[in-house]
């Protein structure tokens, strides 16, 4: 390495050191940088900007040091191509600010910014919070005011410093299938930069029309379907301090529906059902035409659904060790303000031991009553599934 006279010299198998004074004005297109994990830059007064594409191709970079150089500006998306970056040292440069967006999405273990003329502004509130909360090793110096000797309160006490406030106004009335729904996103805050809707969950649930601009964005959902239920409609906004977003769900009313499946024997017995409807329907079971009162031996158990974005609920009428007295017709009635539905199924769990054909031979036993009984051991699973 001592004999290297290039602008940048390799260090170990995946490091690069650029310390020859005044030889670099950009990091774009560093040679052999493909699997670089460490880049050290020093004494480069002409290196003044770090832009979006400057670190393209450095996907493996873990540590970046640019010190004692002329860096004045780091683009908010400068580290887009280095998602694995965990150590960032930009000390002793000419940075007056650094956007929160620059480090967003990175898992930084330490960030060093000492020796920069950082100006006390709302744009650096995120940095002060990191320091206060020890979110990673942050090394800076006291933030400077614009005038000499000015005593600045910590930024957190400056009430005008804050992320935007975002609120979504929704219709108060209930929404039904086929309706048009207008949502309004109201944004308040200092130095608002941009705002928009996130509508990725809404594909196929309605036609969407955006309108308006900061500080009030409109969204019309045309001809909504019941699939819109449980889907997030999100509005976000950004300023110097950070990003805020808020989500709402539009509730689209529709009538109850119900489906019953054939009884299946698991550890216990289960009569599977699916119910849908908005609002969520109330359920009532009937056995042979009479109301079935649920107990710890016969009760409704909903299945935990991995899908939280749908209104349909699945479950079981669970029967613990049912006997012949439980054989019969089971009906599930589901009802909500928009309608009701019912489904029935016959279930036979066990033959009646007291029913016999008079022509069958009657068994006669001369041996004493057998007290031995096969003992069945249900195994309780580790996760305590009932």
């Amino acid at each position: 390495a001592a004999s290297c006279r290039e602008t940048c010299c390799p260090v170990g198998p995946s490091g690069l050191r650029c310390t020859r004074a005044g030889t670099l004005n950009t990091l774009r297109g560093l040679r052999g940088a493909g699997n670089l994990t460490e880049l050290y830059v020093e004494n480069q007064r002409d290196l003044q900007r770090l832009e979006f594409e400057d670190l393209q191709g450095l996907g493996e970079l873990r540590s970046l040091t640019i010190v004692k150089s002329g860096l004045r500006f780091v683009a908010p998306d400068a580290f887009h191509f280095t998602p694995r970056l965990s150590h960032l040292n930009l000390s002793s440069n000419a940075l007056e600010s650094l956007s929160w967006k620059t480090v967003q999405g990175l898992s930084l273990q330490d960030l060093t910014l000492s020796g920069n003329p950082l100006h006390c502004s709302c744009a650096l509130l995120w940095l002060q919070r990191w320091e206060q909360e020890d979110l990673c090793g942050v090394y800076t110096q006291k933030l400077q005011g614009s005038g000499s000797g000015d005593q600045f309160l910590p930024l957190g006490h400056n009430n005008s410093c804050g992320v935007p406030s975002v609120k979504i106004q929704m219709p108060n009335d209930s929404v039904e299938v086929g309706d048009d729904v207008f949502l309004q996103c109201q944004v308040e805050g200092q130095a608002l930069q941009q705002a928009d809707w996130i509508l990725t969950e809404l594909e196929g649930t309605a036609t969407m029309k955006k309108s308006g601009d900061l500080p009030s964005l409109g969204l019309t959902l045309v001809n909504v379907t019941s699939d819109l239920n449980k889907k997030n409609v999100t509005c976000w906004a950004e300023n110097d301090v950070g990003r805020a977003e808020v989500s709402v769900q539009v509730s689209v009313s529709f009538p109850a529906s119900v489906h019953l499946g054939k009884a299946v024997e698991q550890h216990h017995w289960c009569i599977p059902f699916s119910v849908d409807g908005q609002p969520a329907p109330s359920l009532r079971w009937f056995f042979n035409g009479s109301v079935l009162n649920e107990t710890s031996f016969i009760f409704t158990q909903f299945l935990e659904s991995a899908l939280t974005n749908e209104t349909m609920r699945h479950g079981c009428l669970r029967l613990n060790q049912p006997t012949h007295v439980n054989n019969g017709n089971y009906t599930l009635l589901a009802a909500n303000p928009y309608g009701q539905a019912a489904a029935s199924i016959m279930a036979a769990f066990m033959d009646n031991p007291f029913e016999f054909n008079p022509e069958d031979p009657i068994p006669v036993s001369f041996s004493p009553v057998d007290t031995n009984s096969t003992s069945r051991d249900p195994v309780e699973k580790k996760d305590e599934t009932p």
Partner: antibody
């Protein structure tokens, strides 16, 4: 492991009310029914009622319908039994017991309730 | 309300087999009664042993078994041990409520 924790002792005055607790751990609280049982010296065990922790559905022994109210707090995985208008007849040990499949399998250690002026 | 009757006390010796029974005032005990057997040891330590007549609860030793003998539910301890000395309660389910027996005090001498 499955645990049902009950306070050891409650001392209350006649005519008052008391809320007994049964804090659970080691299993998914909302998947099971919880039962409450009364034990008086020389009088064996009496079943008070049951509650489904998932939705608060209850069934009571007729004898205790106007005496006991069963509730659950899912956030703390705790079952409760409130007893009202207490008299000396309510002095007893009260147990919570978990229902799994066809078993009253796990029991609390009981709360000794003394009703005395 | 139904009454459930058990032997008030039984004595056995270590290694012996002993059977405790549980009778219902409403007639024969059936599978619909989901007969449970619960053990009480000193300091009010209750443990569920048997449920649904003959299902052993997880972790219960195999020497405990449940059955129907005639019109009664039964708990059999095959090869009793000194630590089995306890009070054993039978509980029967009647459609929507449990009724407990008075308990059998088992002494293992």
């Amino acid at each position: 492991q499955v645990q049902l924790q009950q306070p050891g002792v409650e001392l209350v005055k006649p005519g008052a009310s008391v809320k007994l607790s049964c804090k659970t751990s080691g299993y998914t609280f909302t998947s099971y029914w919880m039962h409450w049982v009364k034990q008086r010296p020389g009088q064996g065990l009496e079943w008070i009622g049951e509650i489904y922790s998932s939705n608060g559905l209850t069934n009571y022994n007729e004898k205790f319908k106007n005496k006991a109210t069963l509730t659950v707090d899912k956030s703390s995985s705790t079952a409760y039994m409130q007893l009202t208008s207490l008299t000396s007849e309510d002095s007893a040990i009260y147990y919570c017991a978990r229902h799994w499949y066809v078993f009253l399998d796990h029991w609390g250690q009981g709360t000794t309730l003394t009703v005395s002026s | 309300q139904a009454v459930v009757t058990q032997e008030s006390a039984l004595t056995t010796s270590p290694g012996e087999t002993v059977t405790l029974t549980c009778r219902s005032s409403t007639g024969a005990v059936t599978t619909s009664n989901h007969a449970n057997w619960v053990q009480e040891k000193p300091d009010h330590l209750f443990t569920g042993l048997i449920g649904g007549i003959n299902n052993r609860a997880p972790g219960v030793p195999a020497r405990f078994s449940g059955s129907l003998i005639g019109d009664k539910a039964a708990l059999t301890i095959t090869g009793a041990q000194t630590e089995d000395e306890a009070i054993y309660f039978c509980a029967l389910w009647y459609s929507n409520h449990w009724v407990f027996g008075g308990g059998t005090r088992l002494t293992v001498l």
